[in-house]
């Protein structure tokens, strides 16, 4: 690895092209370590509040954790001549609150992008598809990696986070290549109704620690090449006919879902039956009841239908407050 | 208290070259973004050049991109600003300015700035 | 290069009275969890000095009697009650993208 102090060459065009000299190919920025042989740079930790503007154009792994970057503008990552060779952005714990439309733009090999533990108060629409044509160029991005992004309370605005991340995933139909996605701990209280059959190619969908209670609108139908669905540390009480017979559908899917507060009434006889005769959930013999509380911590696949009852409900002249 | 003091202005012939600096005091200098904004005589504002407080992004007006180039030195608390092919048109008073970053940021303290005149 | 419009372009005011100082962008400079629009007061002779930062936080020493708003496209100074040391050129900046840009200013005189 090298290290060295940085000129004033180089700079991105952030819209109207105002900067510098181009690069030097094989220069490395101040307070970043740089491979050339494992085409790799590292600026990890270094308060930095803006991308280096000389990154070396053989840069195919490029690390920029840790840092205090706050805003990517349109073009962050735009060079003459553009960074042609990256592939995989690791922007963890920067400290983002606000990525804009275009931030990823002119990134023609960019394969893997990690925006995880960043509080994004605000997420373009326009963020991975560059543009606001309702088709825009298929995006490169087949690895996008948004855990813990969810800003904390007294910095969410007034629309929902589930629907400003909804938004960015599925404008201009940019993402239909990604084969991972990467939601967890983001506090989803539901998954948006559209967003999972803009994503048909995807592989794995991590949403395990959310707050998700209920999978009833959402539809897995279109995700037949899904091979990890990961649903664990939710808020799921049941999962109901439709949902087993879509994941039942799936071909190579491996469904995870430990640690839900399953409801075990009378509305969870057809999941203990798909239960019993599924391969398609992983640890499922781990699976157990939260409620009612009488049922708590009974094992799912012990159960038969005489366990699982309802109270009837009272006629209202019956019922005592 | 926080300072910075230009220097380095003073009369050049078009097409040469001046190098201004600007000496920081009273605040840790390396933590700092540094701007250079100029103002031609009885003429508003204009933001010239940015370095980050590790050298690391640079970003220049298009009015001066090429020729003129910011650096600093952090162990001498000093920012600086090459200039070449100077025009007539870059006559002004040329002012250092601290910011915390660079979108983020606004030129929360200002130098006295130093005169380029450019004439033959 | 986004465009800040400043109108007036200068302005008397009675000691006093309100001043009020419009700048208008190109294009928007607000963001759901940031402003970037700056005012800057500048006397003769003097480096600008900066009075506002992101729309509507007072700089720390700056007096009460200055105040801004907007978000968006469309920022207000406000100067009341305008007292003789406020005579100067009072200018908006952006940080939204660069090219960092200012308005043209505007002139505040005592009548």
């Known amino acids: 690895t090298s290290s060295a102090s940085s000129s004033s060459s180089s700079a991105p065009f952030l819209a109207s092209a105002a900067s510098a000299q181009p690069p030097l190919p094989d220069q490395c920025p101040a307070l970043c370590e740089c491979s050339e042989a494992a085409r790799t740079v590292k600026c990890v930790n270094r308060n930095l509040t803006e991308v280096p503007t000389d990154l070396p154009l053989y840069v195919r792994n490029l690390f920029l954790t840790g840092n205090q970057l706050a805003v990517l503008p349109a073009g962050a990552f735009a060079r003459r001549p553009p960074l042609a060779e990256l592939a995989a952005l690791n922007l963890s714990g920067s400290r983002l609150d606000e990525v804009r439309g275009g931030a990823f733009e002119h990134l023609p090999s960019l394969r893997q992008l990690d925006l995880s533990h960043n509080p994004l108060a605000y997420l373009s629409p326009f963020a991975f598809s560059g543009s606001n044509a309702s088709i825009s160029a298929p995006s490169p991005l087949v690895e996008l990696i948004l855990n813990h992004i969810v800003p904390p309370d007294d910095k969410r605005q007034n629309r929902s986070f589930e629907g400003m991340v909804a938004a960015a995933l599925v404008a201009g139909r940019a993402l239909q290549g990604l084969h991972l996605l990467e939601l967890a701990s983001n506090h989803f209280l539901y998954l948006p109704r559209d967003v999972l059959a803009q994503l048909p190619s995807l592989r794995y969908l991590d949403l395990s620690n959310n707050s998700l209670v209920s999978l009833t609108y959402v539809s897995f139908r279109n995700l037949t090449h899904l091979e990890s669905l990961h649903l664990e540390d939710n808020a799921l009480k049941v999962l109901h006919n439709g949902t087993l017979a879509e994941l039942q559908g799936l071909p190579h899917v491996r469904v995870f879902l430990d640690n839900n507060p399953w409801v075990c009434d009378c509305h969870m006889a057809d999941m203990v039956t798909w239960l019993k005769q599924t391969g398609v959930v992983q640890g499922k013999d781990r699976l157990t009841c939260a409620f009612p509380e009488k049922m708590r911590n009974r094992v799912l696949l012990e159960l038969n239908s005489a366990d699982l009852d309802c109270d009837p409900i009272l006629p209202p002249s019956l019922q005592t407050s | 208290d926080v300072q910075l003091v230009e220097s380095g202005g003073g009369l050049v012939q078009p097409g040469g070259s001046r190098k201004l600096s600007c000496a920081a005091s009273g605040f840790t200098f390396s933590n700092f973004g540094m701007h250079w904004v100029r103002q031609a005589p009885e003429k508003g504002l204009e933001w010239v050049a940015y370095?980050?407080?590790?050298?690391?992004?640079?970003y220049y007006a298009d009015t001066v991109k090429g020729r003129f180039t910011i650096s600093r030195d952090n162990p001498k608390n000093t920012l600086f600003l090459q200039m070449t092919s100077l025009r007539s048109e870059d006559t002004a008073m040329y002012y250092c300015?601290?910011?915390?970053?660079?979108?983020?940021?606004?030129?929360?303290?200002w130098g006295a700035g130093t005169t380029v005149t450019v004439s033959s | 290069d986004i465009v800040l419009t400043q109108s007036p372009a200068s302005l008397a005011v009675s000691l006093g009275q309100r001043a009020t100082i419009s700048c208008r962008a190109s294009?928007?400079?607000?963001?759901?969890?940031?402003?970037?629009l700056h005012w800057y007061q500048q006397k003769p002779g003097q480096p600008p000095k900066l009075l506002i930062k992101s729309a509507s936080n007072l700089e720390s020493g700056v007096p009460a009697r200055f105040s801004g708003t907007g978000s968006g496209t469309d920022f207000t100074l406000n100067i009341h009650p305008v007292e003789e040391e406020d005579t100067a050129t009072y200018y908006c900046?952006?940080?939204?993208?660069?090219?960092?840009?200012f308005g043209a200013g505007t002139k505040l005189e005592l009548k």
């Open positions: 294009q928007s400079v607000s963001s759901s969890s940031y402003t970037y």
């Open positions: 300015s601290r910011t915390n970053s660079l979108l983020r940021g606004f030129f929360d303290a």
């Open positions: 370095i980050s407080s590790g050298s690391t992004s640079f």
């Open positions: 900046q952006h940080s939204w993208e660069i090219p960092l840009t």
